[in-house]
Amino acid sequence: PGPPPGSPRASPDPRAELDSTVLLTRSLLEDTRQLTIQLKDKFPADGDHNLDSLPTLAMSAGALGALQLPSVLTRLRADLLSYLRHVQWLRRAMGSSLKTLEPELGTLQTRLDRLLRRLQLLMSRLALPQLPPDPPAPPLAPPSSTWGGIRAAHAILGGLHLTLDWAVRGLLLLKTRL
């Protein structure tokens, strides 16, 4: 029958809530790692690849030790929204060129979306301040060439991989303090 009307909802266990978010993050990290390996195998590209529209990496020396849960979740959600947008853009702009990676890219997009929903839920359950809706971002310009798109794919997956590592490390570290 559930709790009587008007009674407060049982407060969630923050460790358990955080834990399930970490698991989704690790799962997405593993998907990203596998896809990065495939991309490097099928479309080798040496050196560091950058894309100006990608978020700057959220961590810096010493920053992990001083993290607070609200700032981690807020920053992670903002960065992952940007990566979701970039993955969607990549699939649209490079559909034919990256056909061999398409099922995996689609799965990555779905799981990224799921993690974003999970973060939103976690923030509301932990009664963290909700962010105002993001202003619409300017559309991403199509890549100038197939090679430009492949370099963009390397930058997007490489950046997402590092961001998810930061997230797993930060969230697990915060979990030890709860």
Partner: antibody, heavy 119, light 111 residues
Framework: EVQLVQSGAEVKKPGASVKISCKAS????????MDWVKQAPGQRLEWIGD????????IYNQKFTGRATLTVDKSASTAYMELSSLRSEDTAVYYC????????????WGQGTTVTVSS | DIVLTQSPASLALSPGERATLSCRAS??????????IHWYQQKPGQAPRLLIY???NLASGVPARFSGSGSGTDFTLTISSLEEEDFATYYC?????????FGQGTKLEIK
């Protein structure tokens, strides 16, 4: 060939500090975390902490927080671990190890650096 | 912290025999498709060497006679047919939470 080469053995007095280096070669240094593990005689292996070379962001086992400092020099593909306020229980072999991002399993290890703390 | 207990502490077997090493965690280290347990081999005077990662994946360059299994709290490293070079100490390690911790080791000796 993927390799991690550590600096040589150290003998230190109690209260002193030691800084160990770990030079990586044969792979892209920023694609993996660098972890540090302690092996004291007759004790379990113990994880000290890790650092992401891309950002220089370290995390530590609470047991070593405040005494261990992890740093990297990206241009030299080298990681460092400094341990301060040394005591006799710090006598051990210290290893650097390459860690897969987000997973903490270690697929390449340095040869180890023996640190002896003795008055 | 999660505590890993390995058994037996030591094991004496002959080349050609099958070795079964156990690792038990104080709480589950498995979740949605992954088990965060890894196995290492260490010989005297050498660094540990990764054998198995994420419970059952064979690390690069490791012979197929090594295999890992298990989920939840109970894990096993199996060496199907022992060779001379397999006599060493074996450690399990988890990475389910921070900090990652190691078992106390199982020493595999020649009978």
């Amino acid at each position: 060939e993927v390799q991690l080469v550590q600096s040589g053995a150290e003998v230190k007095k109690p209260g002193a500090s030691v800084k160990i280096s770990c030079k990586a070669s044969g792979y892209t240094f920023t694609d993996y975390n660098m972890d540090w593990v302690k092996q004291a005689p007759g004790q379990r292996l113990e994880w000290i902490g890790d650092i992401n070379p891309h950002s220089g962001g370290p995390i530590y086992n609470q047991k070593f927080t405040g005494r261990a400092t992890l740093t990297v020099d990206k241009s030299a593909s080298t990681a460092y671990m400094e341990l301060s306020s040394l005591r006799s229980e710090d006598t051990a072999v210290y290893y650097c190890a390459r860690g897969e991002l987000g997973h903490w399993y270690f697929d390449v290890w340095g040869q180890g650096t023996t640190v002896t703390v003795s008055s | 912290d999660i505590v890993l207990t390995q058994s037996p502490a030591s094991l004496a077997l002959s080349p050609g025999e099958r070795a079964t090493l156990s690792c038990r965690a104080s709480k589950s280290v498995s979740t949605s498709g992954y088990s965060y347990i890894h196995w290492y081999q260490q010989k005297p005077g050498q660094a540990p060497r990764l054998l198995i990662y994420l419970a059952s994946n064979l690390a690069s360059g490791v012979p197929a006679r090594f295999s890992g299994s298990g989920s939840g709290t109970d894990f096993t490293l199996t060496i199907s047919s022992l060779e001379e070079e397999d006599f060493a100490t074996y450690y399990c390690q988890h990475s389910r939470d921070l900090p990652p911790t190691f078992g106390q080791g199982t020493k595999l000796e020649i009978k």
